[in-house]
């Protein structure tokens, strides 16, 4: 039952997460121009991944795509590229999890596929968390920068008689949706993963032996990491030999931990 | 078509306020912002405040002490209100619309001649 | 607040004749974000409220003779009229519509000859 919730649970978180990641990634308010020096403009800029804009005090807004390639500065390609590369792997993961789910039923797939799926999910949310997570980073390191070196010659003019503000820019409100948004599709990751762990069967995929030595009941299972599956085929009830060897299959009728939570 | 009419007391006594009202026809209050210029006899264009589409206000520092812009969306009427007004506030007062994009006054009204005097 | 500078305060022109008028502003009145300058100019004929000519510093409002032409950007601007004709006898103002309070200049006055 706990298994099922952690999954359902990171499920759900993941979705979010990436939903969120998508929504940061569409915003046009990834940099806000910064009103600490100017609260009195008319005029209020702000910058997506995608396109500027330029909001009016009437209410008229005018956006503009960055229709050239080429032309972008490396890092925001970089951002965009990180970003992008979250969504899909995001997506992709969502896809997977889906089938993963200990609740839906798909024909007669056994909890070892099952698991396999978790985790690659899991793994999947993870890297796309950490990928949203990294691009917005990039993206407010290259804001401070730019801030920083724009306050620096804040104010250029002929002998002083002329202001010409510069407008700097201050993190906008993709860049916290992004940072919130990256760090559930990382904890739905995670939860997926540790639901991995109890989906799994008591032991391994491959072809567990124990070895009865004489006089003794006490039995060695090599234990490895439950989650190892493959998505290969799984011989059933194939003896290696009679003497005390048991298949992995047999085994499995002993109770597991996990039935009982 | 687009008309902005000013209506005032005309004459004022000095320290008592002035309340003036726009009326508009041809644009609605809650697609335009309205603005309001002075112009002192034989001297130049002051610009006093406005009232934006959706509501909210922005005044000269100078003046915003004393001065207060609101309007009534349905009525489709703009209110200016100034207080413990003075001599050198004896002014023609207009109201104008905005135009929308790029921010400037593309319709005026014919003016309400204010006189501060006891 | 921003100060803007208007120049010659008053000239007298011939009509026909090519008329230029400056305007200087305190702080420069071009926004990166669209890269357009936020000044207007505007006519004022004696005994009439002031009708807006030009618009984004270089924009012509609608029912503006083509002969009314605006230039410049940041801080420094300009109005042409191209041919003076008689009816252009008025005060002309150019005004900051970018940071509040939108001053004005203190005009320039048009005469004909």
């Known amino acids: 039952m706990a298994v099922t919730a952690c999954q359902g649970l990171g499920f759900v978180v993941s979705l979010i997460g990436i939903a969120g990641i998508i929504a940061a990634t569409c915003m046009d308010q990834w940099s806000t121009q910064d009103l600490y020096n100017n609260p009195v403009t008319a005029v209020f800029n702000y910058q997506g991944l995608w396109r500027s804009c330029v909001r009016e005090s009437s209410g008229f807004t005018e956006c503009r795509g960055y229709f050239t390639l080429l032309g972008l500065p490396a890092m925001l390609q970089a951002v965009r590229a990180l970003m992008i590369v979250g969504i899909v792997l995001g997506a992709i993961g969502l896809l997977v999890s889906i089938f993963a789910l200990k609740c839906i039923r798909i024909g007669s797939m056994e909890d070892s596929a099952k698991a396999n799926m978790t985790l690659t999910s899991g793994i999947m949310f993870i890297v796309s968390g950490l990928c949203a997570i990294a691009g917005v980073s990039v993206f407010a390191n290259m804001l401070v920068t730019n801030f920083w070196m724009s306050t620096a010659n804040m104010y250029t003019g002929m002998g002083g008689m002329v202001q010409t503000v510069q407008t700097r820019y201050t993190f906008g409100a993709a860049l916290f949706v992004g940072w919130v948004a990256g760090g559930l599709t990382l904890i739905g990751g995670v939860m997926m993963c540790i639901a991995c762990r109890g989906l799994a069967p008591e032991e391994t995929n491959y072809k567990a032996v124990s070895y009865h030595a004489s006089g003794h009941s006490v039995a060695y299972k090599p234990g490895g990491f439950k989650a190892s599956t493959g998505f290969g085929s799984n011989t059933k009830n194939k003896k290696i030999y009679d003497g005390g060897a048991r298949t992995e299959d047999e085994v499995q009728s002993y109770p597991s931990k996990h039935d009982y939570v | 078509q687009v008309q902005l009419k000013e209506s005032g007391p005309g004459l004022v006594a000095p320290s008592q306020s002035l309340s003036i009202t726009c009326t508009v026809s041809g644009f609605s209050l809650t697609s335009y912002g309205v603005y309001w210029v002075r112009q002192s006899p034989g001297k130049g264009l002051e610009w006093l405040g406005v009232v934006w589409a959706g509501g909210n206000t922005n005044y000269n520092s100078a003046l915003m002490s004393r001065l207060s812009i609101s309007k009534d969306n349905s009525k489709s009427q703009v209110f200016l209100k100034m207080n413990s007004l003075q001599t050198d506030d004896t002014a023609m007062y207009y109201c104008?619309?905005?135009?929308?994009?790029?921010?400037?006054?593309?319709?005026w009204g014919q003016g309400t001649s204010v006189t501060v005097s006891s | 607040d921003v100060v803007m500078t208007q120049s010659p305060s008053s000239l007298s022109v011939s009509a026909g004749e090519k008329v230029t008028m400056s305007c200087k502003s305190s702080q420069s009145l071009l926004n990166s974000g669209n890269q357009k300058n936020y000044l207007a100019w505007y006519q004022q004929k004696p005994g009439q409220p002031p009708k807006l000519l030009i618009y984004g510093a270089s924009t012509r409002e609608s029912g503006v003779p083509d002969r009314f032409t605006g230039s410049g950007s940041g801080t420094d601007f300009t109005l042409t009229i191209s041919s003076v004709q008689a009816e252009d006898l008025a005060v002309y103002y150019c005004?900051?519509?970018?940071?509040?309070?939108?001053?004005f200049g203190s005009g320039t006055k048009l005469e004909i000859k």
């Open positions: 005004q900051n519509d970018h940071f509040f309070p939108f001053t």
């Open positions: 104008a619309r905005d135009r929308g994009r790029l921010l400037a006054m593309d319709y």
